[in-house]
Amino acid sequence: CKAMHVAQPAVVLASSRGIASFVCEYASPGKATEVRVTVLRQADSQVTEVCAATYMMGNELTFLDDSICTGTSSGNQVNLTIQGLRAMDTGLYICKVELMYPPPYYLGIGNGTQIYVIDPEPCPDSDF
């Protein structure tokens, strides 16, 4: 049986504003119409769910209102943006893709994108 390959960049550096973007691309074995994308963060051996969205092919990704993630989809490619990152959020961000409909269900898990976040230096106090 075919595995479902999920590709994502190995390393991404967050911007000085704490925003990181990367592409999660999956090789779909069939014509999925409903796809679920989950971003997981792995630090040491602990894994936490960062955000998740289910979308219909051709439609926009919709994350929860309070989510730190936004994204767009194009074919088998999902462009993910994570905001509000700080240095302590540095870690391996794993893209999990599930083809929910039509059957059969498929699961694919990427190798992860190491996101480095560097907190900006505070501005020096001014004498003015």
Epitope: K2, L40, Q42, Y105, Y106, L107, I109
Partner: nanobody, 128 residues
Amino acid sequence: EVQLVESGGGLVQVGDSLRLSCAASGRSFENYAIGWFRQAPGKEREFVATISWIPRTAYSTTYYADSVKGRFTISGDNSKNTVYLQMTSLKPEDTAVYYCAAGGATGPLALDSHYGYWGQGTQVTVSS
């Protein structure tokens, strides 16, 4: 080579609960997906639930057949190399031989053809 042994089956009443166990030996199952399937007399083998791990972590991802969603829960104990299927609110139509199987950690996890290793099965009978 992975050997799988199921246990916990039996005769129960409608509405009762039962917990099935699938013990793996020969290799750690954290690099596999473990699936539960069932086969009722005169029917084809059908998918019930599956669990898969992100390597080197305790994070698991699960998926269920619509017919058991909300009633059955699949879980795993890596230290014991055992996967459990907790079944509640059992119905007569849940009567079947339940098999556990091991296959690749990603891919079409609801298809029995994905799984290369199978246990001998355990009988579950729900009487009204």
